[in-house]
Interface confidence: medium
């Protein structure tokens, strides 16, 4: 069965997506399975359907049950089931297991805790974060978009993290909370925001017209195994492969260097038969990984050949 478990707390907003997907143009009908009663689409109702979404604004314990969604297209119908459970708010701080979303892990140099289900809601910053019911304070904690970043993670940072945000529906505000566990892994390797060793930012490289020129983009990403990292060149903001100039090609450096245990990559840009118009281009060395993207820009300038006349 196309069934999905969803849960929430009474007096909070809960939005559930139909487990069956369809194009935005398809209509979706929702029913309360126990009574086969159609869920209204009018937004004045506390519980209403809005396309693929079923909205409880706010939720009540009595809303618990199985809801059926039928995605209707001109050629077929698809049926899904949302098993919704609304719980009473706990008087104490403990969050029971049945209210917990999936556990995430972090390490000393890398930690991100995403707020579960937040993409279903119409929310605006700030996103509030709590650990074991205490509001997080201090410069080590940064709420960024829909996730929390913890700097210099320690084993003591393990615990239950709750995100709290406000869902807005037609000018009315509803609170939403979601909790997940965070565990800390002790790892020797780490990854960090890319560091470009060469070229220097805004470097000017002298080249001779008619000769060949090489530019090397070199960056390091951390220590040990690196996950989804790359260096590459762009010309005027365009990938080399898309730029369409066969004289200008990039090729991977000989190997990944691990000097001092650092994981680094080289990418060489080869320009054959340098032309005047090459001096007008902007050459960007890009280094990227899951932490982000760093860019160093290089421009070429004409190197005058040595005059041998006496």
């Amino acid at each position: 069965k196309f069934s999905k478990q969803s849960w929430g707390l009474e007096n909070e907003a809960l939005i559930v997506r139909c487990p069956r997907q369809g194009k935005p143009s398809y209509t979706v009908d929702w029913y309360y399975s126990q009574t086969n009663k159609s869920i209204p689409t009018q937004e004045r109702n506390r519980v209403f359907a809005s396309g693929q979404l079923l909205k409880f604004l706010p939720a009540a314990v009595a809303d618990s049950g199985i809801y059926t969604c039928i995605v209707r297209s001109p050629t077929f119908n698809r049926t899904g089931y949302a098993n919704v459970t609304i719980y009473k708010k706990q008087s104490d701080c403990n969050v029971p297991d049945y209210l917990m979303y999936s556990t995430v892990s972090g390490s000393e140099k890398n930690s991100k805790i995403y707020c579960p289900t937040i993409d279903l809601y119409n929310w605006t910053a700030p996103l509030e974060w709590f650990k074991n019911c205490q509001a997080l304070q201090g410069s080590r904690y940064r709420a960024h978009k829909s996730f929390l970043v913890i700097d210099n993670v320690m084993t003591e940072d393990a615990g239950d993290y709750t995100c709290k945000f406000i869902h807005n529906e037609n000018g009315a505000n509803y609170s939403v909370t979601a909790t997940r566990s965070f565990t800390v892994k002790d790892e020797q390797g780490f990854s960090l925001f890319p560091v470009i060793g060469a070229p220097a930012q805004n470097e000017i490289k002298e080249v001779e017209i008619g000769k060949n020129a090489n530019l090397t983009c070199s960056a390091c990403f951390g220590k040990g195994t690196q996950f989804l990292a790359a260096v590459l060149w762009q010309l005027n903001g365009t990938k080399i492969t898309d730029f369409g100039e066969p004289r200008i090609q990039q090729e991977e450096g000989q190997n990944q260097s691990f000097s001092n245990g650092l994981a680094c990559l080289d990418m060489v840009l080869r320009i054959a038969d340098v032309k005047e118009e090459d001096l007008l281009l902007q050459y960007d060395c890009l280094a990227l990984n899951l932490h982000g993207l760093r860019r160093h820009t290089v421009r070429l300038s004409r190197k005058n050949p040595i005059d041998h006349h006496s």
């Epitope: 989804l228 790359a230 080399i240 691990f258």
Partner: nanobody
């Protein structure tokens, strides 16, 4: 890879792929091969993007955990035609996304069987 198995149509599975050794993976992805068919791309991830084959869009979700150096493939609403051996692969970010030849490191594969 891990997480494969047998499941009824409409069920879910989550595949995991852990990258190890002193490597830098530029792009990682999931490919599958059904009996008697060519290996085909299912979902790809780089540092800044995700791509899905049309046949799995809206049902499969690729995610990555840089702390664990692990790539995941969450497969929901599985269909019998999703049956096959699923492989995790690492390749170059500037390569052709869906071409197996541009992926230079491969896992041993995990079998996914979806019955109706």
């Amino acid at each position: 890879e891990s997480g494969g198995g047998s499941v009824q149509a409409g069920g879910s599975l989550r595949l995991s792929c852990a990258a190890s050794g002193y490597t830098i993976n530029y792009r990682m992805g999931w490919f599958r091969q059904a009996p008697g068919k060519e290996r085909e791309g299912v979902a790809m991830a780089s540092a800044i993007s995700e791509d899905y084959a049309d046949s799995v869009k809206g049902r499969f979700s690729i995610s990555r955990d840089s702390a664990k150096n692990t790539l995941y493939l969450q497969m929901n609403s599985l269909k019998p035609e999703d049956t096959g051996m699923y492989y995790c692969a690492a390749g170059r970010v500037w390569g052709r996304l869906w071409n197996p030849d541009d992926y230079n490191s491969w896992g041993q594969g995990t079998q996914v069987t979806v019955s109706s």
